[in-house]
Interface confidence: low
Amino acid sequence: DSSKWVFEHPETLYAWEGACVWIPCTYRALDGDLESFILFHNPEYNKNTSKFDGTRLYESTKDGKVPSEQKRVQFLGDKNKNCTLSIHPVHLNDSGQLGLRMESKTEKWMERIHLNVSERPFPPHIQLPPEIQESQEVTLTCLLNFSCYGYPIQLQWLLEGVPMRQAAVTSTSLTIKSVFTRSELKFSPQWSHHGKIVTCQLQDADGKFLSNDTVQLNVKHTPKLEIKVTPSDAIVREGDSVTMTCEVSSSNPEYTTVSWLKDGTSLKKQNTFTLNLREVTKDQSGKYCCQVSNDVGPGRSEEVFLQVQYAPEPSTVQILHSPAVEGSQVEFLCMSLANPLPTNYTWYHNGKEMQGRTEEKVHIPKILPWHAGTYSCVAENILGTGQRGPGAELDVQYPPKKVTTVIQNPMPIREGDTVTLSCNYNSSNPSVTRYEWKPHGAWEEPSLGVLKIQNVGWDNTTIACAACNSWCSWASPVALNVQYAPRDVRVRKIKPLSEIHSGNSVSLQCDFSSSHPKEVQFFWEKNGRLLGKESQLNFDSISPEDAGSYSCWVNNSIGQTASKAWTLEVLYAPRRLRVSMSPGDQVMEGKSATLTCESDANPPVSHYTWFDWNNQSLPYHSQKLRLEPVKVQHSGAYWCQGTNSVGKGRSPLSTLTVYYSPETIGRR
């Protein structure tokens, strides 16, 4: 009811002689602050005095009197809500009831707390889960109803007396609700922990033993089995007997059923701890184990591999890899079921024994075409020799071999001929599917491996072919050796180096760039007339009459080729000059007379000079001298001189006669 003070604290606190007690406590007074506090040990109410009698362990009054016991007992509270107490050290005779006498200005209250102090440290308590199964993690809890700030303790876990490796988590509680120290250990027990003793040991701060609690682990687990076999090596021959025995080394709870398995499959009607196999066959080879079950589940023994030995079965050959490329490596594997494994092998290539090959594998580091064929083997063990199986085929692939380019034409080949070539090879695997030719040209391939060159050129020198399957093999180039008439025939002047002047020594050369065959003949021609048959045409002293159009011809057995016409030009001073007169050499006065200086010159005359009968040069320099009107005084002998870059020439005298006209005669 509302007339009560409100207190909160643990109902009973536990400790032992020499330890300490920490009493967490809170309160709420009815009115105002606390004025007086007395801590009684086993208080009793005296009706006569209306007061409490008993040992006063602590007193806090207005006058401030404090008993000597107050050093051991401490009030750690305050005047309105905290009533926490500490007794350190605590003694056996402190057991009993503690009474907290509280007084405020107008109200009084007695609060009772039980204290249980034992002579020696009391043991902690181990709490286990209801069931423990192997390999399943469990939490082991060790609980001690004690905790005090002034007295540190520790809880340690031991398994069969040895500290456990797993890390424990320790927690303490010092609250108005509870006071305890707790250690929790997470642990995955194995079947071998069954029946083992687990201890929780209480120790002081120095690790000194104070007390402990122990439990025996009850670890539920599947049966643990040992399998024994006779003969011990589990190796027998067909027709022998085998005995296997299953021993249970541990089971919790007790086992209920037993069975035998071969290669993971249960054997029917085999439900005892002994398995007898009589007159075994090779099919009974395999992995045997026994299986025993209990309520937790089935346990299996280790497997025993029973080997029923027999001679090798017919062998097969595995090839890595076929088809194989020439030059690559190939491995052959002889596969034969046998027990024990074959110790010796005989290998055959195309039915013929391969010497020195006795291993399960044959490795050929560099395959050649002749390695192709059928490979077979025979396996042998201590029980006998197997049969030769069908064998495996090795296909060796390689580029075409010995490729040649062959000219089909009769020789020699002439420029303009049609040439046929064929591409031949010795062997190929896989088959040749195409051909290539070098150099490339707009040529016909009328059939596979044949090349037709229409109108073969003079400069078609060599041709090479390749035969191709997955790879291309090139033949050495073959020379066509095309024959042709001389080419690029031309006339070349060797001397003189400069222009040809009349009287010079002149040499002309007949040149050509090439000819096949090389043997040639030369012909020189001028105006259709044969001049010579040497490569050079020589003039010791050239004359203007030698000028003209010259050609040379070069012949070989294939044909003849002419040069372009070459013009020979001879330079000479004006010659054969003469003065011609028009209309004639007799002219009537008053008329017109034209004198022309005619000449032969190369280059043409560039400058004329006229002279009279007195060798007096006239002021006229053109080819024609025109006299108009002509006078009688003009009568006389005239001559002319012509000049070109080579020199000068003069004409003989020509006489002009000018006669009087009838009119003049009439006047006389």
């Epitope: 040992e226 399998i227 011990s232 589990a234 280790e302 497997e303 025993v304 591999f305």
Partner: nanobody
């Protein structure tokens, strides 16, 4: 085929420790027991210890009990021989071996199908 490679051997003082490792490769599915053997100069090869494929069963020779233990790492296909308190008489070449067929008689060296090349352990006094 199973290939075995031992490692971890060396020179150690008496009272010291070593850990040998045996790495298995190849057809490791068919392994049933992995064993350790040793051979001192001029002596027969002798059984040291064995561990079953499941890890359920271990055997140790009397001469090494309490000093040597065998463990394994399934993920790595490796078995270990932990050797403590080594003595000069433990000096030998240590071999790792494999039984393919799971015979119960694990101490007999003739029952082991595959062997490693060995690793030298020398214990000096």
């Amino acid at each position: 085929q199973v290939q075995l490679v031992e490692s971890g051997g060396g020179l150690v003082q008496a009272g010291g420790s070593l850990r040998l490792a045996c790495a298995a490769s190849g057809d490791t599915v068919s392994i049933y027991y992995m064993g350790w053997f040793r051979q001192a100069p001029g002596k027969e090869r002798e059984f040291v210890g064995a561990l079953s494929a499941s890890g359920q069963f271990t055997d140790h020779a009397d001469s090494v009990k309490g000093r040597f233990t065998i463990s394994r790492d399934d993920a790595q296909n490796t078995v270990f021989l932990h050797m403590n308190d080594l003595k000069p008489e433990d000096t030998a070449v240590y071999y790792c071996a494999v039984q393919r067929y799971g015979w119960v008689y694990r101490t007999d060296k003739t029952m082991y199908n595959y062997w490693g090349q060995g690793t030298q352990v020398t214990v000096s006094s």
